[in-house]
């Protein structure tokens, strides 16, 4: 029950996280700056990964895409790539985890298969979350190092004079959405990995001394049953018969000419 809950919660948390990563990637408010203020209008500029927008206090807003724009920071392409990789991995992880959910039965899928799928999706969520956190952090670092506070010979706006002013980029809402979403996806992935441990049937072969029948090279191992953890329905307990095979820690059970006293 605890495993099912952990797996289900991990799935839901990752789902919310990936939705957040998608939202952050699409948002325009990755960085913001006030262009100018005056009694008539205040102009606010904000940029995303794909387009830049201008909003005025009158309510007028216009956005323009970067499609053909040259001279964009190279880091922007890296951030785009990280976010897209995060989304793709997260989406695949979600798809895999749906089939891995213990509460969903698909044919005669064994618990070991579900455990493997849970682990795979968990790892995918972890990598997805890390990609999102890395992407947002790279962008934030780009703002701080290159654009955080710059002196520009800039037009101070309507009603203003031409003078050198301090202009500053600030972190937009998308950065915080991305950090939180990446963190959630990461946590969800960890929960899936924890759930995987509970799903996997621990197979322990009890070892015993092998008894050799005269003239035959067949070892019979009593107690060679698969022990179940109780999480799986291990009804296929089999005795193990293997031709002369011994366990690694087994010593030779009959003397040979190489024995030393």
């Amino acid at each position: 029950m605890a495993v099912t809950a952990c797996q289900g919660l991990g799935f839901v948390v990752s789902l919310i996280g990936i939705a957040g990563i998608i939202a952050a990637t699409c948002m325009d408010q990755w960085s913001t700056q006030d262009l100018y203020n005056n009694p008539v209008t205040a102009v606010f500029n904000y940029q995303g990964l794909w387009r830049s927008c201008v909003r005025e206090s009158s309510g007028f807003t216009e956005c323009r895409g970067y499609f053909t724009l040259l001279g964009l920071p190279a880091m922007l392409q890296a951030v785009r790539a990280l976010m897209i990789v995060g989304i793709v991995l997260g989406a695949i992880g979600l798809l895999v985890s749906i089939f891995a959910l213990k509460c969903i039965r698909i044919g005669s899928m064994e618990d070991s298969a579900k455990a493997n799928m849970t682990l795979t999706s968990g790892i995918m969520f972890i990598v997805s979350g890390l990609c999102a956190i890395a992407g947002v952090s790279v962008f934030a670092n780009m703002l701080v190092t290159n654009f955080w506070m710059s002196t520009a010979n800039m037009y101070t706006g309507m009603g203003g004079m031409v003078q050198t002013v301090q202009t500053r980029y600030t972190f937009g809402a998308a950065l915080f959405v991305g950090w939180v979403a990446g963190g959630l996806t990461l946590i969800g992935g960890v929960m899936m990995c924890i759930a995987c441990r509970g799903l996997a049937p621990e197979e322990t072969n009890y070892k015993a001394v092998s008894y050799h029948a005269s003239g035959h090279s067949v070892a019979y191992k009593p107690g060679g049953f698969k022990a179940s953890t109780g999480f799986g329905s291990n009804t296929k307990n089999k005795k193990i018969y293997d031709g002369g095979a011994r366990t690694e820690d087994e010593v030779q059970s009959y003397p040979s000419k190489h024995d030393y006293v």
């Epitope: 960085s31 262009l35 007028f60 216009e62 970067y66 964009l72 922007l76 706006g157 309507m158 202009t167």
Partner: nanobody
Framework: AVQLVESGGGLVQAGGSLRLSCAAS????????MGWYRQAPGKQRELVAD???????YYADSVKGRFTISRDNDKNTVSLQMNSLKPEDTAAYYC???????????????WGQGTQVTVSS
């Protein structure tokens, strides 16, 4: 590079009218504000009129009611209709455009070469 080309200046009698036009061309991303400044000999450059992308306008107190600014966002042009001109309006008029390319703090300011307006009494 971005070029601003002004036209419409000249000599006019006091009380007369003139229309100044300015067209921006080149590697423009999204011009945020366009306007007109003027500089009389021996004086500082001052803002005459300004219009934002959304159509919000600003006028210097000395020209309110006499001058009208208009713009075409798609063509990146701005015009200044000057009526009831006075001798004190005599100056070199400069077109100004403020572009907001992404990740350029404060955006970029561009200026025209200027056009002379002379109002005779």
């Amino acid at each position: 590079a971005v070029q601003l080309v002004e036209s419409g200046g000249g000599l006019v009698q006091a009380g007369g009218s003139l229309r100044l036009s300015c067209a921006a061309s080149g590697s423009i991303f999204m011009i945020n504000a366009m306007g007109w400044y003027r500089q009389a000999p021996g004086k500082q450059r001052e803002l005459v009129a300004d219009i934002s992308r959304g159509g919000s306008t600003y006028y210097a107190d000395s020209v309110k009611g006499r001058f009208t600014i208009s713009r075409d966002n798609d063509k990146n042009t701005v015009s200044l209709q000057m009526n009831s001109l006075k001798p004190e309006d005599t100056a070199a008029y400069y077109c100004h455009a403020h572009d907001v390319p992404p990740f350029v703090p404060g955006g970029k300011s561009y200026w025209g070469q200027g056009t002379q307006v002379t109002v005779s009494s």
